[in-house]
């Protein structure tokens, strides 16, 4: 059962796992949610009746029954983890805490003009978990405007105290706001010899990398595969750090793999969601329950629905036993990973999918693409929407992309002459325009947010957000696309597609079926040569064949240029402008979305 409200002046008795310090009950709830075992918590607020050393303590708790006895206590605030909830969860915390000093290891001290600048510095520093900033009103003259970057083993403060004229806050890495590079490569036959901060068991290097990504201190990792010669170290995942933030020594060893934390691109890759099955593999751990199940998929469902289950092993039925049902072993451990991994016993193992909601919905795998042809099939581009105007008569105006449950990203030039959002309708999950009838459900538009530097498509800033009046329930036919990571600026995308209902040639009409075309990206230098009369800026991206023939056209505007990278689709461009359509040596010009990630997040995350 999902309980989101906080219980004031209430303390849960017993069930303690560990105590951390958090600046608020709300953040305590987030920490509990991300902890592998925490189901409930009790936070102690500042209060004259409470011992100051207990202020800001966040006690993480677990219970076999998923609840604990309640006791009245002034200044205590208790609640439940969001693990029990189905809604999307984020660790992003933009709050600034006034007159609080969050203690940790102060490893960097510098002057900053504002708390915001200090927070940005923390976000762009690989080691920084949180910061404290002494304002210009701080009593001690030599400490005024000092920005202290801090880290701890847990990522949360070691203590929090009241201190006048300082402010504290957390790194915004988990808000997708870091400019740090995102190195996705996994290096085969490589061991990083730097400090081990922790070790866990993992079935493969990808799971190891995801564990590293959500571990507060892990910057890179080494994984020893099941073929590693030392039996005691097989399937061992070493979580590592170094003072420089990079591995100092790479040792070449067969059957080992190493890689980096994907912290700075975690909003566009799955981090918590280990959805694969591992055949002929047994996960060992504390046994929660043994249930009969028809298949390993059914076993995974049972694990996902049992809030305390973290991973499972399924042993298929022996021929005619138990109506063809196998045994499903639901398991847990102190850190969410198996305590040991064994091979060759015939089991099929995997992880709960309960934590998938901690990842961005946009990372969910969608239906395989239909290769060849120009007409799309249902569910192929579930982020694509058709934007209609109802004035003077209803018609398709532009394309757009779902990027959040209340947000559509499109082009600014679509709104030339649009006086009010009231005349707009957004249709999602549509393949054919002919499906749209009087009674077809749509999303009304609450607000049109056009970039304030936009003048005309050709001069850039051709980007706009639509805030919907109601939220989109994600399904197979309507779900978001990931924004590119700022750390991914140097990625070379090779699998890019433009989609829309636009014209198929310059003098044509809106198409009934959603069209798709695979189009290669063109460098900005090459694109500039093709448009000598225009300035192709770094905020634009171009795509097209030298010989022409495939391109976006009128009516595709505002729609996505979608590129697949590491199995995840990213919204790399927004269809903006071009000379004619599909002309030789005239690539299409798109708004370069990565350059607007900050703007998008600022507008969509505004309180």
């Amino acid at each position: 059962e999902c309980v989101t409200q906080l219980l004031k002046d209430t303390c849960f008795e017993g069930g303690d796992i560990t105590t951390v310090f958090t600046p608020s009950a709300k953040y305590c709830q987030v920490v509990c949610t991300y902890h592998p075992r925490c189901l409930l918590f009790t936070f102690t607020a500042e209060s004259p009746s409470e011992d100051p050393t207990r202020w800001f303590t966040c006690v993480l708790k677990d219970s076999v029954t998923e609840t604990l006895p309640r006791v009245n206590r002034t200044a205590a605030i208790s609640g439940y983890s969001f693990k029990q909830c189905s809604h999307q969860i984020s660790a992003c915390n933009k709050d600034i805490y006034v007159d609080l000093d969050m203690k940790g290891i102060n490893y960097n001290s510098s002057v900053a003009k504002s708390a915001q600048e200090c927070q940005e510095r923390c976000t762009d520093d690989v080691h920084c978990h949180f910061f404290t900033y002494a304002t210009r009103q701080f009593p001690s003259l030599e400490h005024r405007n000092i920005c202290l970057l801090k880290h701890t083993q847990t990522g949360t403060p070691t203590r929090i105290t009241k201190l006048d004229k300082v402010v504290s806050g957390f790194s915004l890495k988990s808000c997708a706001l870091s400019n740090l590079a995102c190195i996705r490569d996994i290096f085969p036959n490589t061991v990083f010899a730097d400090s081990n901060i922790d070790s866990v068991m993992a079935p493969d290097a990808f799971v190891c990398g995801r564990i590293c990504t959500h571990h507060p201190g892990c910057l890179f990792f080494t994984f020893f595969s099941q073929e590693w010669p030392k039996e005691s170290q097989r399937n061992l995942c070493l979580l590592k750090t170094s003072e420089s933030g990079l591995p100092s020594t790479r040792i070449k060893k067969s059957k080992a793999l190493s890689g980096f934390s994907l912290q700075s691109c975690r909003h566009s890759i799955p981090v918590f969601c280990h959805s694969s099955f591992y055949h002929d593999t047994d996960f060992l751990g504390e046994e929660l329950d043994i249930v009969a199940a028809k298949s390993h998929e059914a076993c995974q469902k049972l694990c996902t629905n049992a809030v305390r289950c973290q991973f499972f092993t399924y042993t298929p039925a022996q021929a005619s036993c138990n109506e063809g049902k196998g045994k499903c072993y639901l398991k847990l451990s102190s850190n969410g990973s198996p305590t040991k991994i064994l091979h060759g016993r015939g089991g099929i193992s995997g992880y709960t999918l309960r934590l998938c909601k901690m990842d961005n919905e946009c990372t969910t795998k969608i239906k395989p693409r239909i290769v060849g042809g120009t007409a799309s099939v249902r569910g192929e581009w579930p982020w694509q929407v058709t934007l209609h105007t109802t004035s003077p008569t209803q018609r398709h105006l532009c394309g757009g992309s779902i990027i959040g449950n209340q947000w559509i990203l499109t082009a600014a030039h679509c709104f030339y002459g649009v006086e009010s959002p009231k005349i707009l309708r957004v249709y999602s999950g549509i393949l054919n325009q002919s499906e749209i009838k009087e009674d077809t459900s749509f999303f009304g538009v609450q607000e049109i947010i056009i970039h304030d530097q936009y003048k005309m498509a050709e001069s850039g800033y051709d980007i706009a957000l639509l805030k919907l009046e109601t939220t989109v329930n994600y399904t197979d036919s309507q779900r978001p696309i990931c924004l590119p990571s700022k750390g991914d600026r140097n990625v070379i995308y090779t699998d890019c597609w433009v989609t829309g209902w636009g014209y198929r040639k310059l003098r044509d009409k809106i198409q009934n079926t959603l069209q798709k075309a695979k189009i290669p990206l063109v460098t900005n230098e090459e694109c500039q040569k093709r448009y000598r009369g225009h300035k192709i800026t770094h905020k634009m991206i171009c795509a097209g064949y030298r010989e022409g023939g495939k391109d976006a056209c009128k009516g595709d505007s505002g729609g996505p240029l979608s590129c697949k990278h590491n199995e995840v689709w990213h919204l790399v461009g927004i269809t903006s402008w071009g000379e004619g359509c599909a002309q030789r040596e005239r690539p299409g010009v798109y708004t370069n979305v990565v350059e607007y990630v900050d703007w998008i997040l600022e507008k969509t995350q505004a309180v």
């Epitope: 010669p229 030392k230 170290q233 040792i251 070449k252 060893k253």
Partner: nanobody
């Protein structure tokens, strides 16, 4: 049971040399990768050098050209020859087998096998 015993640590003048030895027992030495790590007061554990079971050697940038790692499988021993010592080389030096990195606060950690450490002091 597994044992790693370091020796050879001493006080030396800057520019001087030392040779550290580490005798191993209780495991198959020939199959194991061996390494040296060090920790100075108030500093994190630092990788120094590594020699794989096939004899390939690796060094931290700070010791390249001055330190040499070697192994004698017949004697179950790994050596670290340290020349042109600098004051910043002063630390407790640990020998490790199949360790792949020190711990966060101390070198000794549950991965692999570790010795007790030997003190190297370098005065200027």
């Amino acid at each position: 049971q597994v044992q790693l015993q370091e020796s050879g640590g001493d006080s030396v003048q800057a520019g001087g040399s030392l040779r550290l030895s580490c005798i191993a027992s209780g495991f198959t030495f020939d199959d194991s990768d061996m390494g040296w790590y060090r920790q100075a007061p108030g500093h994190q554990c630092e990788f120094v050098s590594h020699i794989t079971n096939d004899g390939t050697t690796y060094y931290a940038d700070s010791v390249k050209g001055r330190f040499t790692i070697s192994r004698d499988n017949a004697k179950n021993t790994v050596y670290l020859q340290m020349n042109s010592l600098k004051p910043e080389d002063a630390a407790v030096y640990y020998c490790a087998a199949d360790a792949w990195g020190g711990g966060r606060s101390t070198c000794v950690n549950p991965i692999g096998y570790w010795g007790q450490g030997t003190q190297v002091t370098v005065s200027s």
